[in-house]
Every structure is written in C-alpha cells, then in structure tokens.
C-alpha cells in the first residue's frame, strides 16, 4: 500500500549503529549490548566512551557549569572539556567549582605568578622576590 509519512512528532528515532565486538570488547565511541553480541554507538553530544570497553551504557557527557567555558564539546569518544572563566581558577583539592582569583597580594608580598584557569595568583615575600631576581639576572 501507499507509504504514510509520519508527522514530525511521530518520526522514529534514528537507529544507533551496531557492529560486532572484538575479543568481547567494543571500540571507543561504543558500548556493548546486554547479551554481549553487539556494539552500539554512543549518542553524539549526549554520551561517550574513551577506550575499548564492555560498558552496558555509554558515559554521560559533562555539562559545563555557569562560570566555566567549554573548550571542546563532547564527542562519542571524548568528554566535554570545561575550563574556568577568566579571573577564576579550579583547585586540585576542590575541583567541583571555580574560585575567584585574588586581585592582589597581601602587604609585604609581590606577585610572581598570574591567575590562570588552574591556579590563583602567586605571591611571595618581597625579600624572596629580590633573591629570585638576583638569581635569575
């Protein structure tokens, strides 16, 4: 009979690509089916896998928080890369949030390092700074 076009809201979701596992593993950008017979592609922009694996589901893409900029988007083989906005940094011991960089050094100290997305400004005592200057002259 005549083929009926589906209304936009009824359109079937595209089938995820399938292939066979190799040595029981699926390549980056895929996860394995429950029965272990198929490799199913991750959904671009939604989830990913970085290595050969037998994950039952791909890993959810990270969403950059407000206060972060997206350096690179999530692909099927790589998670989103987020970086703190200018003037803020992320510390190793509190990686969940970006903190404001200090605007200046305390009295008696001088700045020897700028604010970066991964470190606050660096301050040292004036005497230490003078010694460093002599050392690197």
């Amino acid at each position: 009979g005549p083929s009926m076009a589906l209304a936009p809201q009824q359109r079937a979701a595209p089938q995820q690509k399938r292939s066979s596992p190799s040595e029981g593993l699926c390549p980056p950008g895929h996860h394995i089916s429950e029965d272990g017979r198929d490799c199913i592609s991750c959904k671009y922009g939604q989830d990913y896998s970085t290595h050969w694996n037998d994950l039952l589901f791909c890993l959810r893409c990270t969403r950059c928080d407000s206060g972060e900029v997206e350096l690179s988007p999530c692909t099927t083989t790589r998670n989103t890369v987020c970086q703190c906005e200018e003037g803020t940094f992320r510390e190793e011991d509190s990686p969940e949030m970006c903190r404001k960089c200090r605007t200046g050094c305390p009295r008696g100290m001088v700045k020897v390092g700028d604010c970066t997305p991964w470190s606050d400004i660096e301050c040292v005592h004036k005497e230490s700074a003078a010694a460093l200057e002599v050392l690197f002259q």
């Epitope: 596992p21 190799s22 040595e23 029981g24 593993l25 390549p27 394995i32 029965d35 272990g36 970085t50 290595h51 050969w52 694996n53 037998d54 994950l55 039952l56 589901f57 890993l59």
Partner: nanobody, 126 residues
Framework: EVQLLESGGGLVQPGGSLRLSCAAS????????VGWFRQAPGKGREFVSA????????YYADSVKGRFTISRDNSKNTVYLQMNSLRPEDTAVYYC???????????????????WGQGTLVTVSS
C-alpha cells in the same frame, strides 16, 4: 549510579588464604567484565584478575596465576577473589573495578576502569 563494595580483607600469615567479595548495587556492575586491581604502598595500581559475568571467562596477571581464583555469583550480583598461598608481596589495597578500559581489543590487561570500589586492605605478614 554504579556502586561497588569490597569486603574480606585483613591480616593473614604467609601461605594463608583470604576471600575477597565485591558486591554491586545500583545499575549492577555497569559492564560485563568485572575485575580486581591492587595498589601496594608507594606503588601504582596494578591489574590482578577479571571475569566475564556472562560466560565466566577469566583473566589473570602472571604474578597471581595458579594462586588466585576469580569467580562470580550473578544471582547475588557479587564477584569473588579467592587468594591462596599468599606472599608478603601480595600486601596491598585491593580494588574491585568495572567498566574495564583497554587500549586495544586484543589486550589482556586493562589500563584502567570507569567504576571503582573504595578498596579493602590485605596485609600478608608473620
């Protein structure tokens, strides 16, 4: 969220035995293969053993082959590591891991994992 909980660690004399358990909660193990890694004091994490939960295929590091046996009970969502003929060099924190990651399909040794337990300490000493 996949959560792995190890138990069974402790102090044992050289030549002794221990059985470690790894129970999964949440979306089960999140992968077909489940493994054990260990980390000795001051050293990096090293692969110990893995098992396929569907067909029971097992994998072992050369250092534990013939002494350690990995097994699973799918009805209990648990993987076991039976450790016999223990040596002082087996002293380490043992971690259960799932979502094992490999650089190539043919590799027998995973380079890491997605999901980790909190670890259980095994001390082999007289």
């Amino acid at each position: 969220e996949v959560q792995l909980l190890e138990s069974g660690g402790g102090l044992v004399q050289p030549g002794g035995s221990l059985r470690l358990s790894c129970a999964a909660s949440g979306r089960t193990f999140g992968s077909i293969r489940v493994g054990w890694f260990r980390q000795a004091p001051g050293k990096g994490r090293e692969f110990v053993s893995a098992i396929n939960r569907n067909d029971g295929t097992t994998y072992y590091a050369d250092s534990v082959k013939g002494r350690f046996t990995i097994s699973r009970d799918n009805s209990k969502n648990t993987v076991y590591l039976q450790m016999n003929s223990l040596r002082p060099e087996d002293t380490a924190v043992y971690y259960c891991a799932a979502g094992l990651q490999y650089n190539r399909a043919a590799d027998r040794v995973p380079v890491g994992a997605v999901y980790w337990g909190q670890g259980t300490l095994v001390t082999v000493s007289s």
